[in-house]
Interface confidence: low
């Protein structure tokens, strides 16, 4: 019995309640598809954002603010960013294939909307994607890296103040709104009620404001999508950039895969892995009869010490092995014994 | 990409000491040993020692113990060799390389010492 | 220590020519052999690794071969911007040792 299913678009689910990329920049878009039998063809179209305006004097419904319709190929991208559409490539998913489209904008020029759209036998899906192109305010985090639960960082929205001015900070609530198949995301900016907004400290330079939100002691419940408004000084139009914040849960070190005890010959050499993880990620040493290895022009450990050749083994080589990954959370080791057969040439090296 | 940033030339009078710096980037510094090699004017290379980052553990060729002593700073991604008791046998370009399991991958510009009354 | 004996210690050669450069190891070092190659005035090269691995970026007229006690680096259609001197290098064990080098000339 094989049931058929019309292409189901991944993103839908995942999608944030604002697209906003800063200008001149590359982006890929991504529409995953889950069909059967798998779509015969993805299609990627679009418009100007202007072209498919929010206007209050439109008769526009609320779970669909965009009411689109001139949609053009992405071949045609004549007024609009240069494109590029990356073959299709297969991945298994959640335990589904999936067939996956992505489309590449050289450089973020004009705000648009992208639309892909996946046929198969039984049906069509799409995914509208707003592509709200700003030239400022900006988002950086700092230190520029996820941190993990327990760690400080800030986040920094820079804006130019000979253009923008009344710089805030805000985070998404947790219950993004309801998105409805084939509708955008309502724009940010047009939804102030849906965010909290949070206290930051305000610096200047010569030619920037700067808001700096800082988060001390992060918790997975700092997790989310934060936003920086700033208004245009001149039309007081407010421009929005989101950062999706994640922090990384502190997991103590564990070892993946076995070191198995083995046996070898004098003269052969021996290589074994040892992968840790954890967070922070745990540093490997390796122990040899209880004590630390030293890495010789034998003994060679690479990859951050995940990685252990011994090269040209001796009779003294044999012994038991352990590889021990730590971090400020504690340690996991895993053990092997090796074995070395044969007799011993005699050497007159160091 | 990598790169090995050594310290200035050194002119020294005999008997002095004089410490070679070699600050690393473009790779992690802890993962790979940091070599040492002696290039006397218009002679072959001469290797001196190795020490690994990682855990300060070093090894030096017979004739340089006493005379060579390298240590690493982690924390600004930079190795030190230390040469004492200078004579006129240790005037030579002193080159710092990152050690690539038994070769040495890449290399730093060199640091000419000059030992002179 | 392991002795490492180069030959020839200077050559001439042509524009196009192919030359070997030979490496003698006084004992097994099996194929932990390295070749450098260091123009005047410049800082060594690493060329080829653990005998016959070229290193990133070396142009592939360059190649390594041998295993033991004997090496050979083979340039083959010699460019102007191969003239200098060439090292070989041990990493079978410490203290590391270099060959005393080959100078590569122009005829």
């Known amino acids: 019995l094989v049931v058929y299913v019309p292409p189901q678009i991944g993103e839908k689910s995942l999608i944030s309640p604002v697209d906003s990329y800063q200008y001149g920049t590359t982006q890929t878009l991504t529409c995953t598809v889950y069909a059967i039998p798998p779509p015969h063809h993805i299609h990627w179209y679009w418009q100007l954002e202007e072209e498919c305006a929010n206007e209050p004097s439109q008769a526009v419904s609320v779970t669909n603010p965009y009411p689109c319709e001139e949609w053009r190929s992405v071949e045609d991208f004549q007024g609009g960013n240069k494109i590029e559409v990356n073959k299709n490539q297969f991945a298994l998913i959640e335990g589904k294939n999936k067939t996956v489209s992505t489309l590449v904008i050289q450089a973020a020029n004009v705000s648009a909307l992208y639309k892909c759209e996946a046929v198969n036998k039984v049906g069509r899906g799409e995914r509208v994607i707003s592509f709200h192109v700003t030239r400022g305010p900006e988002i950086t985090l700092q230190p520029d890296m996820q941190p993990t639960e327990q760690e400080s960082v800030s986040l920094w929205c820079t804006a130019d103040r000979s253009t923008f001015e009344n710089l805030t900070w805000y985070k998404l609530g947790p219950q993004p709104l309801p998105i409805h198949v084939g509708e955008l995301p309502t724009p940010v900016c047009k939804n102030l009620d849906t965010l909290w907004k949070l206290n930051a400290t305000m610096f200047s330079n010569s030619t920037n404001d700067i808001l700096i939100m800082e988060l001390k002691n992060a918790s997975l419940q700092d997790q989310g999508d934060y936003v920086c408004l700033a208004q245009d000084r001149k039309t007081k139009k407010r421009h929005c950039v989101v950062r999706q914040l994640t922090v990384l849960e502190r997991v103590a070190p564990t070892i993946t895969g076995n070191l198995e005890n083995q046996t070898t010959s004098i003269g052969e050499s021996i290589e074994v892995s040892c992968t840790a993880s954890g967070n922070p990620p745990p540093q490997i040493m390796w122990f040899k009869d209880n004590e630390t290895l030293v890495e010789d022009s034998g003994i060679v450990l690479k990859d951050g010490n995940r990685n252990l050749t011994i090269r040209r083994v001796r009779k003294e080589d044999e012994g038991l092995y352990t590889c021990q990954a730590c971090s400020v959370l504690g340690c996991a080791k895993v053990e092997a014994f090796f074995i070395i057969e044969g007799a011993q040439e005699k050497t007159n090296l160091e | 990409q990598v790169q090995l940033q050594q310290s200035g030339p050194e002119l020294v009078k005999p008997g002095a000491s004089v410490k070679v710096s070699c600050k690393a980037s473009g790779y992690s510094f802890t993962d790979y040993s940091m070599y040492w090699v002696k290039q006397s004017h218009g002679k072959s290379l001469e290797w001196i020692g190795y020490?690994?980052?990682?855990?300060?553990?070093?090894s030096y060729k017979q004739k340089f113990k006493g005379k060579a002593t390298l240590t690493v700073d982690k924390s600004s991604s930079t190795a030190f060799m230390h040469l004492n008791s200078l004579t006129s046998e240790d005037s030579a370009v002193y080159y710092c390389?990152?050690?690539?399991?038994?070769?040495?991958?890449?290399w730093g510009q060199g640091t000419s010492v000059t030992v002179s009354s | 220590d392991i002795q490492m004996i180069q030959s020839p210690s200077s050559l001439s050669a042509s524009l196009g020519d192919t030359i070997t450069i030979t490496c003698h190891a006084s004992?097994?070092?099996?194929?932990?052999l390295s070749w450098y190659q260091q123009k005047p005035g410049n800082i060594p090269k690493l060329l080829i690794y653990k005998a016959s691995n070229l290193h990133t970026g070396v142009p592939s007229r360059f190649s390594g071969s041998g295993s033991g006690t004997g090496f050979t680096l083979t340039i083959s259609s010699l460019q102007p911007e191969d003239i200098a001197t060439y090292y070989c290098q041990q990493g079978q064990s410490y203290p590391l040792t270099f060959g005393a080098g080959t100078k590569l000339e122009l005829k």
């Open positions: 004992q097994n070092i099996n194929v932990w």
């Open positions: 020490i690994d980052p990682y855990n300060d553990d070093t």
């Open positions: 390389a990152k050690g690539y399991a038994d070769a040495m991958d890449y």
